[in-house]
């Protein structure tokens, strides 16, 4: 299963960030977004968004904090390889 492409983190504020990515139409049933403060373990947050979406706003983030985010495409119950990025609020 090919991964989504071109993950961009934009509009970063002290407590939010916009994720956007590309994928062929109807390539995935949904996208799984996982993010966590980079310096912590056991804190990963998992979100699912519809396969028709190509952006998502992360909210409730902590100011001045580095985050690691990964996005996976999901099709027929199978998960693609991830596309990952690191950003700081």
């Amino acid at each position: 299963l090919p991964a989504p492409k071109n993950l961009v983190v934009s509009e970063v504020t002290e407590d939010s960030a916009r994720l956007s990515w590309t994928a062929p139409d109807a390539a995935f049933d949904s996208f799984l977004i996982q993010y966590q403060e980079s310096e912590k373990v056991g804190e990963a947050i998992v979100l699912t968004v519809p396969g028709s979406e190509r952006s998502y706003d992360l909210t409730g983030l902590k100011p001045g904090t580095e985050y690691t985010v990964s996005i996976y495409g999901v099709k027929g119950g199978h998960r693609s390889n991830p596309l990952s990025a690191i950003f700081t609020t």
């Epitope: 996982q34 966590q36 310096e39 912590k40 373990v41 056991g42 804190e43 990963a44 998992v46 690691t68 990964s70 998960r79 991830p82 990952s84 990025a85 690191i86």
Partner: antibody, heavy 117, light 112 residues
């Protein structure tokens, strides 16, 4: 040299609040990326994570026990505390505190707690 | 919650043999730009507290003999002990530390 040592009441009665203390040395909870957690193990059984606290005072709790747990710290004294409210016999276990830094890398020797009427 | 399933629950081998034990997570514990598996293995000898052997699924903790090897990725992991010694008598737990913290129920290693 990193060390952690747990202390507790030993024995307490059902419905009481269990208060545990973790005293540690060899690291600081002022250091970014560092946390301390609590794990318990009933005799002859497996390991169960209870709670953890980070250098920045973020806390995490086992969802099944969250309503009964309170974790806190005294950074300057190198102490972490865990309170478990309304204990019953199912809370009888050995309680361990652990350092978390990228992984749970150092464990205390454990303190045995018995809940009995 | 991510559930961790270990197998077998116990096994017995003779000293000098090689042993493998399995751990399966209910969802992938692979995460991040560096593609790390948030999976550790612990050894708990009778009457002692657990000791970290392996983290990031395959990185040996300092001081751990190289006969302990961790492998696997995603949801399926293996701990291999080559040339088993009498002092390896213990229960071995796998543990995920990606989303909260959960442990497997353990594999008890006995020496024949």
């Amino acid at each position: 040299q990193v060390t952690l040592k747990e202390s507790g009441p030993g024995i307490l009665q059902p419905s009481q609040t269990l208060s545990l203390t973790c005293s540690f040395s060899g690291f600081s909870l002022n250091t970014s990326g560092t946390g301390v957690g609590w794990i318990r193990q009933p005799s002859g059984k497996g390991l169960e994570w209870l709670a953890h606290i980070w250098w920045d005072d973020d806390k995490g709790y086992n969802p099944a026990l969250k309503s009964r747990l309170t974790i806190s710290k005294n950074t300057s004294s190198n102490l972490v505390f865990l309170k478990i409210a309304s204990v019953d016999t199912a809370d009888t276990a050995t309680y361990y505190c652990v350092r978390i830094k990228g992984r749970m890398d150092y464990w205390g020797q454990g303190t045995s707690v018995t809940v009995s009427s | 919650n991510i559930m961790m399933t270990q197998s077998p629950s116990s096994l017995a081998v003779s000293a000098g043999e090689k042993v493998t034990m399995n751990c399966k997570s209910s969802q992938s514990v692979l995460f991040g730009s560096k593609q790390k598996n948030y999976l550790a293995w612990y050894q708990q000898k009778p009457g002692q507290s657990p000791k970290l052997l392996i983290y990031w699924a395959s990185t040996r903790e300092s001081g751990v003999p190289d006969r302990f090897t961790g492998s696997g990725s995603g949801t399926d992991f293996i701990l291999t002990i080559s040339n088993v010694q009498a002092e390896d008598l213990a229960v071995y737990y796998c543990h995920q530390y990606l989303s909260l913290f959960t442990f497997g129920s353990g594999t008890k290693l006995e020496i024949k």
